[in-house]
Interface confidence: medium
């Protein structure tokens, strides 16, 4: 009979014995339970020590289940972070390799002599992507200034250009009034494209990393006193009652687990974070395509060089006006001009057929597709966590057996109290444990803020801006109305807001900078420019 079964502790002895409990501590039959702290003080199979040990074990079981349930989130975000990071870095390497091939073919020996400038550019782009670099404005302005210093003398082999003159030249080129634009619009267009793409890529991989860190921390659940007691009533007390095979009711489990997790949930910030990832992923394979940007770096630089060649008379006149006429090279020291075919090729335009292609091809599309599919499984994770935990056979009866009797916390029967949701408003009515109505605890608030910050950064990057400093959308030239080019991004983009001007002469990487720089006054003549 049922009375006989529940009078015996045989089943409990068998279960706890297998877990390494000393059978001396477990009576063969039920004893009076006045000594119990958590379980009903009725007949029991548990001594005080057994109850205390079971309390610790039930906590560990719960913690383990929560961490196991979320391990796929941590692993997925970590794996996606690694894959996207590798992809973006590979694309920068592919772009550098393509540019080397392109320029070696087009410009021959002259490229080889100046390859360090291009390598330096890619090194600084990597630094910016990896968060250790300076702003892209300065990186790109520096690159074009160095390029001009190397290329301008090649247009005028009959003149000598000492370092002071070259310094005047590069200052003139980076002047905020935009009076000299030796490379035409190419610097602005390249800056716009690279900045939007790198800012987006950086925000995206940072977002994945933040998500992984937040989740792995959030899954380490501290167990409050109330939660600990509720967990014991849920899965420990059936053992003490002598009915270890009587599984807790599903509703009972949901109320306990939701109570234990109530101040730990990351909704609605989690859903917004997933939205941010998806929005930015779409931009990275569409208008902010990393592949297209990587491919076009060489093309845009080449377009700039073409512009300089075609407008060399105008550019030179401006330079000679501002920096003074250069000294002619004595005839005996004059370099022989490069061979005709090389000189012609130096300024040849990169043709469409020569645009570098990448082995990655549709890589990004595949990565984004995989990400979409995985993020779909992550949505609702925190709301579903209690169901996942209660779906484990150690925690509750199978939900499909709801009509069958189960452990209610007091005995065998059906669980009658309402099942409450996970939100603070509902948890106030949790019948199983008193939940702090003030909402998330401090560590959870901090994690939610981290998610919010990552989401804001991603959504801002998706609009073409950088939360960490400069705006990727703004016009860098300092002149004109900030017109957007349809071939850069989407036709019909809104003109960006005006930006405060950059200081006229940013310090150069070699340490020189500031107005005057100790150079001869002759190289700074012309109209004065306030520093």
């Amino acid at each position: 009979s049922e009375a006989k079964v529940t009078r015996s502790c045989a089943e409990t002895r068998q279960v706890l014995g297998a877990r390494g409990y000393s059978l001396n501590l477990i009576p063969p039959a039920l004893i009076s339970g006045e000594h119990l702290r958590v379980c009903p003080q009725e007949y029991t199979c548990c001594s005080s020590e057994t109850e205390q040990r079971l309390i610790r074990e039930t906590e560990a079981t719960f913690r383990g289940l929560v961490e196991d349930s979320g391990s796929f989130l941590v692993h997925t975000l970590a794996a996606r972070h690694r894959k996207f990071d590798e992809f973006f870095l590979e694309m920068l390497s592919v772009a550098q390799h393509s540019l080397t091939q392109l320029f070696s073919h087009s410009y021959g020996r002259l490229y080889a002599q100046h390859a360090l400038i291009f390598n330096g550019l890619f090194s600084r782009l990597r630094d910016f992507y990896g968060e250790s670099g300076e702003g892209l404005d300065d990186t790109l302005a520096d690159f074009w200034a160095q390029l001009l210093e190397r290329v301008f003398p090649l247009l005028h082999p009959q003149y000598s250009f000492p370092p002071d003159y070259l310094l005047c030249l590069s200052r003139l080129a980076s002047s905020t009034d935009g009076s000299l634009q030796p490379f035409g619009d190419s610097p602005r267009r390249l800056r716009l494209q690279i900045t939007r793409t790198l800012v987006a890529a950086r925000a995206f991989v940072q977002g994945l990393e933040t998500g992984r860190n937040v989740v792995s921390e959030a899954l380490k659940v501290p167990v409050s006193e109330g939660c600990s007691q509720a967990l014991m009533r849920l899965i420990g007390c059936p053992l003490c009652r002598g009915v270890p095979s009587l599984m807790p009711c599903q509703g009972f489990c949901l109320n306990v687990v939701r109570g234990c997790l109530s101040s730990r949930g990351l909704e609605p910030d989690w859903g917004n974070y997933l939205d941010g990832l998806l929005i930015l992923a779409d931009k990275l394979q569409g208008p902010f395509s990393f592949e297209l940007t990587a491919e076009s770096i060489g093309v845009k630089i080449s377009e700039g060089l073409m512009y300089l060649q075609e407008n060399s008379a105008k550019v030179s006149a401006q330079v000679f006006q501002e920096c003074g006429p250069p000294d002619p090279v004595p005839a005996r020291n004059r370099r022989a001009p490069p061979p005709r075919e090389e000189a012609g090729r130096l300024w040849s335009m990169v043709t469409e057929e020569e645009r570098p292609t990448t082995a990655a091809g549709t890589n990004l599309h595949r990565l984004v597709w995989e990400l979409r599919e995985r993020l779909a499984r992550m949505r609702g994770f925190w709301a579903r966590l209690s169901l996942t935990v209660c779906g484990d056979s150690r925690m509750a009866a199978d939900a499909s057996l709801e009509a069958a009797p189960c452990w209610t916390g007091a005995g065998r029967g059906r669980y009658l109290p309402p099942v409450v949701g996970g939100s603070p408003a509902e948890q106030v009515n949790n019948p199983e444990l008193k939940v702090d109505a003030s909402g998330p605890d401090v560590p959870t608030r901090r994690r939610r803020l981290q998610l919010r910050a990552a989401t804001a950064r991603m959504k801002t990057a998706a609009l073409g801006h950088d939360l960490d400093g400069q705006d990727a959308d703004e016009d860098a030239s300092g002149s004109g109305g900030g017109q957007q080019y349809a071939d850069d991004w989407m036709a019909g983009a809104v003109a960006p807001p005006a930006r405060p001007p950059r200081p006229p002469y940013p310090p150069r990487r070699d340490g020189s900078g500031g107005k005057g720089g100790g150079g001869s006054a002759r190289y700074n003549q012309g109209r004065s420019r306030s520093g």
Epitope: Q250, G251, L254, R258, G265, E267, P268, G271, G380, W382, A383, R384, S386, L387, A399, S400, E402, P418, V419, V420, G421, G422, S423, A425, E426, V428, N429
Partner: nanobody
Amino acid sequence: EVQLVESGGGLVQPGGSLRLSCIVSRYTYATYSMAWFRQAPGKGLEGVSGLDSVGATGYAESVKGRFTISRDNSKNTLYLQMNSLRAEDTAVYYCVVDPASAKVTYGSWSTPSYAYWGQGTLVTVSS
């Protein structure tokens, strides 16, 4: 595992009507709270309407008087009748379910903390 399958979305002219359906593959669903959420292009999730096992219903201000939520326990199905549709109702509509029995009663139906989410059905209101 609970599965949710929405249907009934499509293209409709302003002022027109649509009825969304959501079939829930679990018989205990009668004790669950259910709701419809939507997400317009480039926007966040918005709670449209909720219904709990107690029978209480909740609606977003923007749809009150135009949308009606209901359920048929014998068919395990949740419905959303949408009348007088406007261009701003264009969105992907999601059916959501949670074992909490009284989300509307407790005033938390519009928070997107639901355990199960459908794949969504697109509603486009355009002339």
